[in-house]
C-alpha cells in the first residue's frame, strides 16, 4: 500500500498510459517543509521501479526519463532517505504500456439467409491491452450509410442489423472498420461486395427420401430451400464410412435422383445451397438425414462345409456348416436358410428352413448318393443355392496332402503348410483347411472352422477363433471332383508346459506286467498340444533315479502296459505330460506291488 501523496507529488508525462517503446517522464517533488530536518541538501530522493532503485537525486525534486517498459503495468515509487532514518514513501505511479491498434485485416461480411442481417468479421491483429473502440461503416447506393460501434477489448464481429434485399443484386456496398484506442487508430482496407457476394443461404431443411416400389434403384431425395437458390451440393455416405460421395446439381428445385446406393445400408445425407454459379458462398450443410435403403435379394453363394460321422452299419450322421453372407452379399436381414437334402438316384428330397443357426445335423442311410443345397433368404428373395455332393472326404489316400505342418505365427495365428498329394497334383481343384478345438471325447458340438485355398497354394494362415494355449485338430483336405483325401495334425498358436500331470486312476496286474490307466488332463490345463506322456516309477524308499517310459500322445489313449517291474517290490508311480514348451509337474503318486512270479 502506498500512502496518498501527503509529503510530495509524482507527475507523469505524457500520460500514465503510453505506447510500447516510448519514453515516460516521471517527476517526484517534495511539498514544502516535508524534507529531511535541518538541511534540505541532505534530502535524497530515490525512484524505485518495483523494488529496484533506478535513480536518485539530492534536493527537493527528482526527474527521471524511463524507456523500455514492457507491456502491462509497471509500478514506480518515490522515497525520501534522510541520514540515520528509514526511507519514507513519498508517492507512487503506475504506468501502463499498451499498443496502438494494428490495421484490421481480412474484413469480410455475410448475410445469413435472404431474410438475415449483414454481419462482418475481421482480424484485430496484435492485442493492444487497451480499451479499443471499433467502428464499422457500411455505405451503399444512393449515399446510404450505416454505422455500428463496439467497445470491447476483444471486438472482432459486428452485426449491422440491416437486411440487404435482392431488388438490385448487382449494387455495390462498401464496408470499412476503424479501430481507435487512447494510443492511436487504424482503418481496414475497404471491402466492396454485392448482394450476391455476401448472402449465404440458409442450409436446406425438411430433407426426405423416397424409394419407389421399395427399390434402392429408384431413390429420390427431396428438400426445401430459400427462393433464390440456384445450386446444390449433395453429400452422402454409409453411416459406418468416413468418405463422402459428392454430387453437384443446378436448378434442382428441391429434388434429385440417386442411382448408386447400396441396398440395406444406413446412409447419412446432407445438402448445401448457393445463390450463384461463381459469386457468394455455400450455405452450411443441412442437418443430416439418416435413412436405411430397402433390401434386395441376396447375391453371392454360401460357403458350405460338412462333416460325416459313422453311427452304425446302416446309418451316418451328416453335420452341415455354412458361413454368414457378407453384409454386401446379404443385402438385407437374413430371415432363414433353406437346406435341401436329396438322394440323387431315388430323387427323394427333404427341405428344411433353419433360423438362428448356421449349422444343421441329420441322420441319413449309409447307402445311396446324397447331395445338399443351402441358400439364404431375406424379405426380397433367396441367394443362389450352394450344392455339395456328400462324399467320404478322406477316402482317396492318393489325394491326401503330404508333410502337413502347423506352426505358431505370432499372436493367435497358426501357419499350416503342406505338400501336394502324390497323385497328379493338377487334379486338385481346391484345398480346405479345417480346424477345431481338440476335445478328448471327440465332441461333435465343438465349433468347426474352415477356409478354402486355391489349388496352387501350399499354405494357409488360420486366425479365426484361434486362442492361445489351446490345441487344435487341423485337417487339410484336397478335393478333386467327387473324391477327397485328407491329412491331419495338431497345432497351437502359443504353448507352455502343462499345468498338471495326468491323474493315475487305476493300476492292474496282467500276466506279470501292469496296466496303468489315467484320466486326461483337463483341456484348460494342457496349455497347448500334448506331445508325450511320461510314466515314472521307482522303488519305494529308494533314493535312486526313477525309471521312465515315454509314450507318444494319442487323443483316445488313456492306458499303457509296463512289464519291467520286479515282483514283490513296492513301487511308487506317477505321470507327467509334455508340450513343445516343456514338462508338467507330477500327477498323483500311486504305490503298487506286483504279486506275480519273477521272470
Amino acid at each position: 500500500k502506498i500512502d496518498a501523496c501527503k509529503r510530495g507529488d509524482v507527475t507523469v508525462k505524457p500520460s500514465h498510459v503510453i505506447l510500447l517503446g516510448s519514453t515516460v517522464n516521471i517527476t517526484c517533488s517534495l511539498k514544502p517543509r516535508q524534507g529531511c530536518f535541518h538541511y534540505s541538501r541532505r534530502n535524497k530522493l530515490i525512484l524505485y521501479k518495483f523494488d529496484r532503485r533506478i535513480n536518485f537525486h539530492h534536493g527537493h525534486s527528482l526527474n527521471s526519463q524511463v524507456t523500455g517498459l514492457p507491456l502491462g503495468t509497471t509500478l514506480f515509487v518515490c522515497k525520501l532517505a534522510c541520514i540515520n532514518s528509514d526511507e519514507i514513501q513519498i508517492c507512487g505511479a503506475e504506468i501502463f504500456v499498451g499498443v496502438a491498434p494494428e490495421q484490421p485485416q481480412n474484413l469480410s461480411c455475410i448475410q445469413k439467409g435472404e431474410q438475415g442481417t449483414v454481419a462482418c468479421t475481421w482480424e484485430r491483429g496484435r492485442d493492444t491491452h487497451l480499451y479499443t473502440e471499433y467502428t464499422l461503416q457500411l455505405s451503399g447506393p444512393k449515399n446510404l450509410t450505416w454505422q455500428k460501434q463496439c467497445k470491447d477489448i476483444y471486438c472482432d464481429y459486428l452485426d449491422f442489423g440491416i437486411n440487404l434485399t435482392p431488388e438490385s443484386p448487382e449494387s455495390n456496398f462498401t464496408a470499412k472498420v476503424t479501430a481507435v484506442n487512447s494510443l492511436g487508430s487504424s482503418s481496414s482496407l475497404p471491402s466492396t461486395f454485392t448482394f450476391l457476394d455476401i448472402v449465404r443461404p440458409l442450409p436446406p431443411w425438411d430433407i426426405r427420401i423416397k424409394f419407389q416400389k421399395a427399390s434402392v434403384s429408384r431413390c429420390t431425395l427431396y428438400w426445401r430451400d430459400e427462393g433464390l437458390v440456384l445450386l446444390n451440393r449433395l453429400r452422402y455416405r454409409p453411416s459406418n464410412s468416413r468418405l463422402w460421395n459428392m454430387v453437384n446439381v443446378t436448378k434442382a428445385k428441391g429434388r434429385h435422383d440417386l442411382l448408386d446406393l447400396k441396398p440395406f445400408t444406413e446412409y447419412e445425407f446432407q445438402i448445401s445451397s448457393k445463390l450463384h454459379l461463381y459469386k457468394g458462398s455455400w450455405s452450411d450443410w443441412s442437418e443430416s438425414l439418416r435413412a436405411q435403403t430397402p433390401e434386395e435379394e441376396p447375391t453371392g453363394m454360401l460357403d458350405v462345409w460338412y462333416m460325416k460321422r459313422h453311427i452304425d452299419y446302416s446309418r451316418q450322421q451328416i453335420s452341415l456348416f455354412w458361413k454368414n453372407l457378407s453384409v454386401s452379399e446379404a443385402r438385407g436381414k437374413i430371415l432363414h436358410y433353406q437346406v435341401t437334402l436329396q438322394e440323387l438316384t431315388g430323387g427323394k428330397a427333404m427341405t428344411q428352413n433353419i433360423t438362428g443357426h448356421t449349422s444343421w445335423t441329420t441322420v441319413i442311410p449309409r447307402t445311396g448318393n446324397w447331395a445338399v443345397a443351402v441358400s439364404a433368404a431375406n424379405s426380397k428373395g433367396s441367394s443362389l443355392p450352394t450344392r455339395i455332393n456328400i462324399m467320404n472326404l478322406c477316402e482317396a489316400g492318393l489325394l491326401a496332402p503330404r508333410q502337413v505342418s502347423a506352426n505358431s505365427e505370432g499372436m493367435d495365428n497358426i501357419l499350416v503348410t503342406w505338400q501336394p498329394p502324390r497323385k497328379d497334383p493338377s487334379a486338385v481343384q481346391e484345398y480346405v483347411v479345417e480346424w477345431r478345438e481338440l476335445h478328448p471325447g471327440g465332441d461333435t458340438q465343438v465349433p468347426l472352422n474352415w477356409l478354402r485355398s486355391r489349388p496352387y497354394n501350399v499354405s494357409a494362415l488360420i486366425s479365426e477363433n484361434i486362442k492361445s494355449y489351446i490345441c487344435y485338430e487341423i485337417r487339410v483336405y484336397a478335393l478333386s471332383g467327387d473324391q477327397g483325401g485328407c491329412s491331419s495334425i495338431l497345432g497351437n498358436s502359443k504353448h507352455k508346459a502343462p499345468l498338471s500331470g495326468p491323474h493315475i486312476n487305476a493300476i492292474t496286474e496282467e500276466k506279470g506286467s501292469i496296466l496303468i490307466s489315467w484320466n486326461s488332463i483337463p483341456v484348460q490345463e494342457q496349455m497347448g498340444c500334448l506331445l508325450h506322456y511320461r510314466i515314472y516309477w521307482k522303488e519305494r524308499d529308494s533314493n535312486s533315479q526313477p525309471q521312465l517310459c515315454e509314450i507318444p500322445y494319442r487323443v483316445s489313449q488313456n492306458s499303457h502296459p509296463i512289464n519291467s517291474l520286479q515282483p514283490r517290490v513296492t513301487y511308487v508311480l506317477w505321470m507327467t505330460a509334455l508340450t513343445a514348451a516343456g514338462e508338467s509337474s507330477h500327477g498323483n503318486e500311486r504305490e503298487f506291488c506286483l504279486q506275480g512270479k519273477a521272470n
Partner: nanobody
C-alpha cells in the same frame, strides 16, 4: 463496467473557478486511472488531467498550474479544481475511468458536463 456521473459544470466568467466532480459506481474491478478529458466544438477530444490510484498526476500543458486533480480512492471520486478559467477552456468535460480487466485496461466514460467560460 463502471458507471460515471459528472457534476459541477456551468457558466463562469473568465478568471473564475469551478470544481468538477465525478463519482464511479457499479463495478468491483480496481480503477487504475481516473481522468478528465474535454472536447470543444469542432475539435478532437483531449486529455486535461489524470490521477492514478497511487496519487501520481498528469496535466495537459495548457492547464498546468491552473487546474488540480485529486482523487478519493475509498469513494472512487475524482475532482477537478479549475482556477483562472479562460474562454478557451470552454468545452464539454468528460470523466473517464480505466479499470484492470485481466492484463488489459478497459475504459468507461461519463456522459459529460458543459463548462462555458465567458469573457
Amino acid at each position: 463496467q463502471v458507471q460515471l456521473q459528472e457534476s459541477g459544470g456551468g457558466l463562469v466568467q473568465a478568471g473564475g473557478s469551478l470544481v468538477l466532480s465525478c463519482a464511479a459506481s457499479g463495478s468491483a474491478a480496481l480503477i487504475f486511472l481516473m481522468s478528465w478529458y474535454r472536447q470543444a466544438p469542432g475539435k478532437q477530444r483531449e486529455l486535461v488531467a489524470e490521477v492514478s490510484r497511487y496519487g501520481s498526476t498528469t496535466y495537459a500543458d495548457s492547464v498546468e498550474g491552473r487546474f488540480t486533480i485529486s482523487r478519493d480512492n475509498a469513494k472512487d471520486i475524482v475532482d477537478l479544481q479549475m482556477n483562472s478559467l479562460k474562454p478557451e477552456d470552454t468545452a464539454v468535460y468528460y470523466c473517464k475511468a480505466d479499470q484492470y480487466y485481466g492484463d488489459s485496461l478497459r475504459s468507461s466514460w461519463g456522459r459529460g458536463t458543459q463548462v462555458t467560460v465567458s469573457s
